[in-house]
Interface confidence: low
């Protein structure tokens, strides 16, 4: 593989100090066309992750084999994909680095995923800033999959890619729907062209068995070694702070490789340097771990110590990857010099020993400071050691002191003293302090003085509305940070208590004293605007409105709609009690009225700015009902209706409408228009003989008016079946003369 490394400096407090360096260990690399090969190229790849345009980045060449990119002015400049191209001819290789914003909504648990052909890849995006919305997964910038926000598992959104193939390789992103792409979690998936442990054109060749996290190249079978390791199988560790295929490069700066991400040719991808881990490669390996990203475990035996850069360092007389090859006298292995437990816990203490003859359960014992001897309850026998497990009775403060593990066989004996510290879980002596308050949140300083022992590993804040019997809500916070209690009710008193924990089982202390904190009620600032309205009846109006989109939660409890009737000098107010509402139906309005309408957001008792007003004219209502409707049978098929005009008419009547229905009949009624509004009589013809009918009528001006009273009348005789009712109107006198 080409000796090409892309280094990203991740000290992100100041983007202007950020830099990318591409280093080549190839002979003559980077000297340009006048030397042995093409120059090193280092650039931002904007094909998938585009960021707002800014000042151009500065490229500086440092000697023959190094190129550096600087000139980042703001954090968003850093987000995206960078690539370095080096090597000549068929060996020309591209190394890719993917940068995630530390302030993104979603963060990748692991940026680079190298998997074998046919494997299942699982990309995990951790929720850093929650948004209650879908998560869109994209592959190389194209929509790929959506996850509902309830589908998060333990605060993570997982994308499972079963049976991956080389074309599945690329840049994947997880973005909240309708959020800025810069808040995405970006991943790089590298799919080797072969199954596990294989390489070559038909994947027929066997990989050499790369050590220390090295990855077998699927084309040439060479191990691409993690930064800080060398050798054909990556079996040898470089000195601290060195990298490159022959450990020839030195990490810049006094803190060595801290804060640097190393990207190597595929199929390796990117990782921290040896001895470092974390999203910004600023954390040293935990005890017992070493190598790039601290992914390797030392598992040193027989007193070997774990060096986070190189692995096990064995004492004299021992050797092997884990210092597992040893002399034969019995020996206590890997016993910690100091152990810490919490008061009243019942810990299990393990004591491992090796030797010849092999130690058995009864040959290992544990002695407390008061001289009590504990016998092991269980032993795990492995080829190279026996581990005895001791169940310790409930600890008291007097158990603090030096304990001793002793092994005795016919080959001799060994003992190891270790200190046990019994710690008292912390209990707050004071209530938490309120720093700032808003309508729906309280910012609290949780760290208070406490009795018992530190360090404080976890601070739990318990809170609930004052005088409430509901369960306490609990939030776990970082001991060093202030905490924001979210989604609270405005103008509400909350009882808030702190519970402190120290590391280890049983480290939770009792709850501290409560304090009362009350949420605020700020004035709403958003000005709504009326989107539209439509009349749903002479006295009903449907109104819809919108709010400007602003970052942060909506400050408001609901909306107030105001209708001003200028002619009558009356104001109507309608309260909409949901801040999410964007529409309301106003009923009981006065028909034919000209209203001025506006809407404003309210919060508690405070009103925000009113929308620009709208002017709405409701249609007038219909006229009153005709009076004294009377029906008189004239024959076996005719009935005459007479009536008096309605009183207090708002205008001239355009027509009357008569409703005819057979009494007790199930069919629809028939409506007949009387188009000469001056008339007060009409004859309904074509009725069935000996049939009881129901009649009512109403007048119309611009709209239909109220119905009159209903009258009943039966036709006469036993005539023939008529074809259906029709009407004939005349002046009342003329009809009576006939």
């Amino acid at each position: 593989a080409v000796d090409l490394t892309l280094l990203a400096n991740l000290r992100l407090t100041d983007p202007q100090r950020f830099f990318l360096t591409c280093v080549s260990g190839e002979a003559g690399a980077g000297r340009g066309s006048d030397a042995w090969g093409p120059p090193l190229l280092l650039e931002k790849d904007d094909r998938i992750v585009r960021t707002p345009p800014g000042p151009p980045l500065r490229l500086a060449r440092n000697g023959s084999h190094q190129v550096t990119l600087r000139g980042f002015s703001k954090p968003s400049d850093l987000v995206g994909v960078f690539s370095c191209v080096g090597g000549a001819g068929a060996r020309r290789t591209r190394v890719i680095y993917v940068h995630n914003s530390p302030g993104a909504h979603l963060l990748p648990d692991k940026v680079t995923h190298t998997v074998n052909k046919g494997d299942t890849a699982v990309l995990s995006a951790r929720v850093h800033k929650e948004k209650q919305t879908d998560v869109i997964w994209k592959s190389n910038g194209s929509y790929f999959y959506t996850l509902d926000w309830h589908e998060a598992q333990d605060g993570r959104f997982l994308l499972q890619l079963p049976n991956v193939q080389p074309p599945s390789s690329g840049i994947y992103s997880a973005t909240y729907l309708e959020a800025s792409p810069l808040g995405s979690a970006f991943f790089r998936l590298i799919v080797r062209g072969c199954g596990a442990g294989r390489w070559g054109p038909g994947c027929t060749k066997e990989c050499p068995g790369c050590l220390h996290g090295g990855v077998c190249h699927d084309h040439d079978g060479e191990c691409v070694c993690p930064p800080g390791f060398t050798g054909t199988r990556c079996e040898q560790a470089c000195r601290e702070g060195r990298f490159g295929q022959s450990c020839q490069e030195q990490c810049p700066g006094i803190s060595g490789c801290r804060g640097l991400t190393f990207c190597l040719p595929d199929p390796y991808g990117c990782s921290c340097g040896s001895g470092w881990r974390g999203s910004q490669c600023q954390e040293a390996c935990a005890p017992g771990h070493f190598g790039a990203d601290c992914r390797l475990q030392c598992q040193c035996q027989n007193g070997g110590t774990c060096d986070r850069f190189s692995g096990c360092v064995c004492p004299s007389g021992w050797h092997g990857v884990h210092c597992e090859k040893s002399d034969r006298i019995p020996q206590i292995l890997n016993m910690a010099s100091e152990l810490e437990f919490n008061l009243e816990t019942m810990p299990r203490i393990n004591c491992a020993a090796a030797g010849n003859p092999f130690p058995v359960r009864g040959s290992i014992e544990l002695r407390k400071p008061d001289g009590t001897v504990l016998l092991s309850t269980k032993a795990i026998v492995e080829p190279e050691k026996t581990t005895a497990e001791f169940e310790v009775p409930r600890l008291v403060l007097a158990d603090s002191g030096f304990w001793e593990c002793r092994v005795s066989t016919s080959g001799g004996q060994d003992s190891r003293r270790f200190k046990v510290n019994v710690k008292v879980p912390p209990v707050p002596l004071a209530a938490p302090r309120l720093l700032t308050k808003q309508s729906r949140q309280l910012v609290v300083s949780p760290l208070v003085s406490f009795s018992g022992d530190g360090p404080i590993s976890t601070v739990r804040l318990h809170y609930r509305p004052q005088d409430s019997t509901m369960d306490w809500s609990t939030i776990v916070v970082d001991p060093s940070e202030n905490v924001t209690l979210m989604n609270l009710r405005p103008k509400t008193g909350y009882s808030v208590r702190v519970q402190l924990s120290r590391p280890g089982e049983g480290g939770e202390g009792a709850w501290g004293p409560p304090t009362l904190m009350t949420t605020d009620c700020p004035e709403p600032l958003l000005q709504p605007w009326l989107e539209g309205w439509h009349v749903e009846g002479t006295d009903r109006l449907r109104v819809s409105w919108s709010l400007p989109l602003v970052p942060g939660p909506l400050v408001g409890d609901g909306f107030l709609l105001r209708l001003w009737d200028g002619t009558r000098g009356q104001e109507r107010r309608e309260n909409v009690s949901s801040p999410q509402a964007r529409t309301a139906l106003l009923t009981g309005l006065t028909p034919g009225t000209h209203y001025q309408l506006d809407v404003q957001l309210y919060h508690c008792t405070l009103l925000g700015p009113a929308s620009p007003p709208a002017h709405v004219l409701l249609p007038p209502s219909g006229p009153p009902a005709p009076r004294h409707l009377h029906a008189q049978a004239l024959s076996d098929s005719e009935i005459q209706l007479t009536w008096k005009h309605p009183e207090a008419l708002p205008g001239p009547i355009s027509k009357y409408v008569v409703e005819v229905q057979v009494a007790g009949g199930a069919g629809d009624p028939l409506w007949i228009d009387v188009d000469r509004p001056e008339e007060t009589s009409t004859i309904i013809r074509g009725l069935n003989a000996s049939t009881r009918y129901l009649f009512r009528m109403r007048a119309s001006i611009q709209g239909l008016g109220d119905w009159s009273n209903t009258v009943e009348e039966s036709t006469l005789g036993n005539g023939l079946q008529a074809e259906g009712p029709v009407q004939e109107s005349r002046a009342a006198e003329e009809g009576l003369d006939q």
């Epitope: 948004k131 209650q132 919305t133 879908d134 869109i136 929509y143 959506t146 996850l147 509902d148 926000w149 309830h150 589908e151 909240y176 729907l177 309708e178 959020a179 989604n487 709010l547 989109l549 602003v550 970052p551 942060g552 939660p553 909506l554 801040p579 999410q580 964007r582």
Partner: antibody
Framework: EVQLLESGGGLVQPGGSLRLSCAAS????????MVWVRQAPGKGLEWVSG????????KYADSVKGRFTISRDNSKNTLYLQMNSLRAEDTAVYYC????????????????????WGQGTLV | DIQMTQSPGTLSLSPGERATLFCRAS???????LAWYQQRPGQAPRLLIY???TRATGIPDRFSGSGSGRDFTLTISRLEPEDFAVYYC??????????FGQGTKLEIT
Amino acid sequence: EVQLLESGGGLVQPGGSLRLSCAASGFTFSNYVMVWVRQAPGKGLEWVSGIYPSGGHTKYADSVKGRFTISRDNSKNTLYLQMNSLRAEDTAVYYCARVNYYDSSGYGPIAPGLDYWGQGTLV
Amino acid sequence: DIQMTQSPGTLSLSPGERATLFCRASQRVTSNSLAWYQQRPGQAPRLLIYDASTRATGIPDRFSGSGSGRDFTLTISRLEPEDFAVYYCQRYGSSVLYSFGQGTKLEIT
């Protein structure tokens, strides 16, 4: 007045296909998330599929994934459900419904319920 | 997947009485994202309550919702004859992935 009218239901043999339509009126169709919900005879409600306003994002219940396709034509104010490889257990009244969708300013959109439903079509 | 379980399966009461229907989620329901529906025989469901306690437009105030986390309640303070129907609870999110409960049948004693 908001109205949703389903059509396209009927009798079909197992393995067959059917396309349901839902004609929407009385509101700005292209602004709303729409869903299909079904109810087998004598049984409860089961969400089938949903589609976002632009039509670019869709969701399916596991029981219909790969067989049913939801789509929409915003110019015709119509929602569709293409049902292939039908099974006896797909027998149900299929309702289309509108999602009462809002954005609580800063927390992303919430879909708090189905505020309007069609009368249903029997498959 | 969040499962919604309603209880009781059937509730027999008389008009004028108080009805209490329960809905339990298999996992915590974020932001009280829960709705209740009423379905009368031969009709489409009707939205009653959303956000666990907010009444939908036009729903009488005898219907009220409460609860948070995993346990939710629908209460009908005084039963009217038209209230006898099947009631469903439903979990919702920002997506359109909905989980309905199996329903509670409210019948006249």
